[in-house]
């Protein structure tokens, strides 16, 4: 008698390893013999697909070599025209030993930056990833973390992070190890001990001592007044990534000696500089403070403006303060080529004394800003017209670079000599007699925003502030 199909062995979940065989059995009782079709994720499996073998009148489906992409829901459907079609479904779970698909690579990184060592894995169950540094498991902390992807992220890389690393991927089926990679931490050249300035008698022997560190170990060169040291003996030693250089000098003239530590990072170099002065008798000694240091002005642009042998402040927020500050002045001076002969010398004096601020001794030598009164004299008397143009250009964003903005002081942010005559520097170039000022052309604006102070006569050493000038 005809009999509708009944699936006597329902499909079950099958676990299979990659590259192994997986078989689903769909035993059917019926009369006449049914037609059995198979689907994966509701898509019909074609009889001629060579990745599959369908036997026993369609009751056995074999995946000949399981791939990672084969997982899904497999269903068999039996139909013999008697009654309705019947269906049974089961899942194929592809199990996979851990496999590292993107292993870590050797990394060179500069101290303080972020390092990421990749370790992307495959596997089912999903492998857990851990890392080994040297021979020990790597502990995570606030800086070091294993990301969800398995990659190792190290924030603010430190010297002690250098070493050999490998990642380990583990699941219930096995463990995979990456090859060992090297994390090399490079450190910018840094001066540990700067040479000290000396005030000595003529003919003395002085040893300047400079110690630097970095990875790779830096080289040290000595510069005397801007040129390679021509005399004196240099002794060097290297121990534990620290280079120690001693320059012995026979002193017959004062000089500025700079120790330059240099090391290479790929195609780039990092340098650190420290300077000391050798002075004879009353020559001044520049000392370092935490924002920069004092040194004799050795540039060209401000030669005519700054006093001979002026000690100026070099700002160490620039990698090369002398060069950077000189470039600032140079850029600003180019803008001055078009200003009036009345404005130009005053503006040049202002720029040079603002960018290369006079050094003032004290607890530590520090830069001394220009007095507000002199700044205002330039802004509202000597260069009133030009200043208005510059402010307009700045407002409209017409300058090619913004470097000149650093060159022009904001007068209101400068100290007044009225409250502390030692808080700021005068501009000797503006110490004209009041008689001379009467010959200056009238201002463009009807009245300056503040009254211009009386500038001292050249014979006077003190600065008399006009009674009306009381801007605080």
């Amino acid at each position: 008698l005809p009999k509708a199909p009944v699936i006597t062995t329902p499909l079950e979940t099958v676990d299979a390893l990659v590259e192994e065989v997986a078989t689903f059995m769909c035993a059917v009782e019926s009369y006449p013999q049914p037609e059995i079709s198979w689907t994966r994720n509701k898509i019909l499996i074609k009889l001629f697909d060579t990745r599959y073998s369908i036997r026993e009148n369609g009751q056995l489906l074999t995946i000949l070599s399981v791939e990672d992409s084969d997982d899904g829901i497999y269903c068999c459907t039996a139909n013999n025209g008697v009654g309705g079609a019947v269906e049974s479904c089961g899942a194929l779970q592809v199990k996979m030993k851990p496999k590292i698909t993107r292993p870590p690579i050797n990394v060179k990184i500069i101290e303080g930056l972020k390092a990421v060592l990749p370790c992307t894995t495959m596997g089912n169950p999903k492998p857990s990833v851990s890392w080994i540094k040297g021979d020990s498991p790597l502990r995570e902390n606030s800086r070091i973390a294993v990301l969800e992807s398995g990659s190792l992220r190290i924030h603010n890389v430190q010297k002690e992070d250098a070493g050999q690393y490998r990642c380990v991927a583990k699941n219930s089926l096995g463990t995979a190890y990456s090859k060992v990679v090297k994390l090399e931490v490079e450190v910018f050249a840094r001066i540990l001990r700067a040479p000290e300035s000396h005030n000595v008698t003529f003919g003395s022997f002085v040893t300047l001592h400079c110690t630097a560190t970095g990875i790779p170990v830096p080289t040290i060169t000595w510069i005397e007044n801007g040129n390679a040291v021509s005399s004196g003996s240099i002794q060097e030693s290297v121990k534990d990534r620290v280079i120690d250089s001693r320059l012995q000098l026979f002193i017959t003239k004062p000089g500025l000696y700079t120790c330059i530590a240099t090391n290479k990072h790929g195609e780039k170099f990092s340098t650190a500089k420290a300077a000391a002065t050798i002075s004879i008798a009353e020559w001044s000694k520049p000392q370092k403070d935490n924002k920069g240091y004092c040194a004799q002005y050795r540039g060209e642009v401000c030669n005519a403006v700054l006093a001979k042998d002026a000690l100026v402040f070099l700002n160490t927020s620039y990698a090369d303060p002398e060069e950077a500050q000189e470039l600032l002045v140079h850029t600003a001076w180019n803008e001055l080529k078009v200003v009036s002969p009345v404005c130009r010398p005053a503006a040049e004096a202002l720029l040079c004394n603002h960018i290369f601020q006079e050094c003032s001794p004290g607890v530590v030598p520090t830069p001394i800003p220009i007095c507000r009164e002199y700044c205002l004299a330039v802004k509202e008397l000597f260069c009133a017209k030009e200043w208005l143009v510059m402010e307009e250009k700045t407002h409209r964003g017409l300058y090619r670079s913004e470097m000149h903005l650093l060159s022009v002081p904001e007068c209101s942010k400068l100290p007044s000599m009225h409250w502390d005559p030692t808080a700021c520097a005068r501009l000797p170039h503006l110490d004209y007699n009041k008689e001379n000022l009467k010959t200056f052309p009238p201002m463009t604006s009807s009245k300056p925003s503040v009254d211009i102070p009386n500038l001292p006569s050249s014979s006077s050493s003190s600065f008399s502030v006009s009674p009306t000038y009381s801007m605080t």
């Epitope: 004092c294 004290g362 942010k413 400068l414 100290p415 409250w419 030692t422």
Partner: antibody, heavy 115, light 112 residues
């Protein structure tokens, strides 16, 4: 006219702490170096500390580690925190405006350290 | 630290007399770059706060009478009161500002 008004002085036991304040007016406080100077009874002047326009502080060796100078440019106020006070810290404490010279002085606030 | 030594420790003068007070520093207080002497003079009248008289060794602070003048260089400095007045009775201090500030021990001026 520059005015510097100190406050916060008083009697304190050895090992104790005190916080001195100096309210400044009549000038743009943030643009100037500010100092603390003290004068023990019947004695001379002793400079203690200076704070520059970037709030970088410097101290005399005698108070380094015990005293802390600070400034609040919004409130136009200079502070001196005195910790671990000793009897020899008994003095009149002056707030002073000035960089190379001590140009303007307050009237002072008396600190007495005694058990 | 630079040590400042003042002399004499006290002086008595009559009104109209000239008075000189000396101050010696243990090392030079002249800054080579600008050749300024970082030496200041102060007056402290009884019961009052000190006031600045002279800075940079010889520059008179504004509002200070012309009878007060300063001179000297390197390590030796002098404060001169050309014609002493009754209101000049005070203690006078020198102070160096070349490094961490230090004061002299003071000179007491009494008027006869």
């Amino acid at each position: 006219e520059v005015q510097l008004v100190e406050s916060g002085g008083g009697l304190v036991q050895p090992g104790g702490s005190l916080s001195l304040s100096c309210v400044a007016s009549g000038f743009t406080f943030s643009l100037y170096y500010m100092n603390w100077v003290r004068q023990a009874p019947g004695k001379g002047l002793e400079w203690l500390s200076v704070i520059d326009t970037h709030s970088i502080a410097y101290y005399a060796d005698s108070v380094k580690g015990r005293f802390t100078i600070s400034r609040d440019n919004v409130k136009n106020t200079l502070y001196l925190q005195l910790n671990n006070l000793k009897p020899e810290d008994t003095a009149l404490y002056y707030c002073v405006l000035g960089r190379t010279a001590l140009v303007r002085w307050g009237q002072g606030t008396q600190v007495t350290v005694s058990s | 630290d630079i040590v400042m030594t003042q002399s004499p420790s006290s002086v008595t003068a009559s009104v109209g007399e000239k008075v000189t007070i000396n101050c010696k520093s243990s090392q030079s207080v002249v800054f080579g770059s600008n050749q300024k002497s970082y030496l200041n003079w102060y007056q402290q009248r009884p019961g009052q706060s000190p006031r600045l008289l002279i800075y940079y060794a010889s520059t008179q602070e504004s509002g200070i009478p012309d009878r007060f003048s300063g001179s000297g260089s390197t390590t030796d400095f002098t404060l001169t009161i050309s014609s002493v007045q009754p209101e000049d009775a005070a203690v006078y201090y020198c102070q160096q500002a070349y490094s961490a500030p230090t004061f002299g021990s003071g000179t007491r001026l009494e008027i006869k």
